[in-house]
Interface confidence: medium
């Protein structure tokens, strides 16, 4: 796994697709639908918590139309998640035994229908803007979670949220090293797939502690970091240390070597 030492880390491809148009929804802005599992366990969010989780990570809970558009663009995820209408669904392109749901062996978005708000699932979020820049930070000894928080703060930034990383990925951020995010997770964005970087599809990879794709990394373990600097704090070109101009896309990779 890129950028990792422990042999107990496992990655999920977490393929994410850009949604650019939805049939019957011509005004849907371009954006990214992504599966989100905050915290260490699967299926832990009530409907209200699911909405809050998306907001907390810089996104909103996805609509059925957005998930359908993502599915039609090739998005697949064998995890049930809340959507904005309080239904629980998941998109399956290649049906297989554990992921059949209500559609037998046919491809499609599986649905559990409207579920009681107290039941717990994962969530599908949608993010369509990045109001600032995400940058990759590292140093020789890398960072514990707290060190990453403090390092980003010392560079007039905060640790990036998962939603911000997905938004940056959709704008071209590609880094084959896992980095801390604000929710304590470890992820890395891949635009151009290559064998050493966790799969043959573009997407944001998530590093889990256990092979069943649960568990957060030990906060004292050392990794790289992804920081986020909001628009109001983004320096104009040439202001950043070393005079490196800010990328027009709002995405840049700063390799910080100061200790």
């Amino acid at each position: 796994t890129p950028g990792l030492g422990p042999a107990t880390a496992f990655t999920s491809e977490d393929l994410v697709v850009q949604v650019t148009a939805v049939p019957g929804q011509p005004h849907l802005p371009g954006g990214v639908v992504f599966h989100y599992r905050p915290g260490p366990t699967r299926y832990s969010l009530t409907f209200e918590e699911a909405q809050q989780a998306c907001l907390r990570t810089g996104a909103v809970i996805a609509s059925p139309e957005q998930l359908q558009a993502a599915y039609e663009a090739g998005y697949e995820q064998c995890d049930a998640g809340w959507l904005r209408d309080q239904t629980v669904r998941y998109p399956i392109v290649s049906p297989r035994t554990p992921c059949v749901g209500d559609k037998d062996s046919s491809p499609g978005v599986r649905t559990y229908g409207v579920r009681p708000s107290t039941e717990t699932y994962d969530v599908y979020c949608f993010v369509d803007r990045l109001e600032g820049e995400v940058f990759f930070a590292t140093r020789l000894e890398q960072f514990t979670f707290q060190e990453a928080l403090e390092f980003c703060e010392s560079h007039n930034a905060t640790l990036a949220t998962t939603g911000q990383l997905y938004a940056a990925w959709s704008r071209g951020l590609d880094k084959c090293y896992a980095g801390w995010l604000a929710d304590g997770s470890l992820r890395y964005p891949i635009v151009t797939p290559r064998p050493a970087c966790g799969g043959d599809k573009p997407g944001v990879r998530t590093v889990y502690l256990y092979p069943n794709q649960t568990g957060l990394p030990d906060p004292l373990s050392r990794h790289h970091a992804f920081c986020f600097r909001g628009i109001s704090a983004v320096p104009s070109p040439g202001e950043e240390e070393g005079g490196t101009p800010t990328s027009p896309s709002g995405v840049e990779e700063w390799i910080v070597t100061q200790v």
């Epitope: 905050p38 915290g39 260490p40 366990t41 832990s44 209200e48 918590e49 809050q52 989780a53 907001l55 907390r56 990570t57 979670f145 928080l149 403090e150 980003c152 703060e153 905060t158 640790l159 949220t161 604000a182 929710d183 304590g184 957060l216 906060p219």
Partner: nanobody, 123 residues
Framework: DVQLVESGGGLVQPGGSLRLSCVAS????????MGWFRQAPGKEREFVAA????????YYADSVKGRFTISRDNSKNTVYLQMNSLRPEDTAVYYC????????????????WGQGTLVTVSS
Amino acid sequence: DVQLVESGGGLVQPGGSLRLSCVASGRTFSSYAMGWFRQAPGKEREFVAAITWSSATTYYADSVKGRFTISRDNSKNTVYLQMNSLRPEDTAVYYCAAARIPVGRRSENWDYWGQGTLVTVSS
């Protein structure tokens, strides 16, 4: 919105212990990172400790590491700060804070604040 109410402060001798509690209103308590800050007379408010919404991660100011422990009970909408081996320099008003993400040590990045509870360490 989230309302935060701290309790548990008081007068304690050096080397003693106190446990602060912060109760949050609202059903979405478990969606927030929670933190403790403190402000001594004539000084700026400073970060003490924080905990992520799932309790998966805790982090501390260097000055309290090994002496203070932050924890939370989402079923009770409560976050705790267990303070051991207290020192005179720990004297301050302690504030509970909430944020949508664990945003670190800058107090301006936290969304909600309690009114504070006074801790005095003196013999």
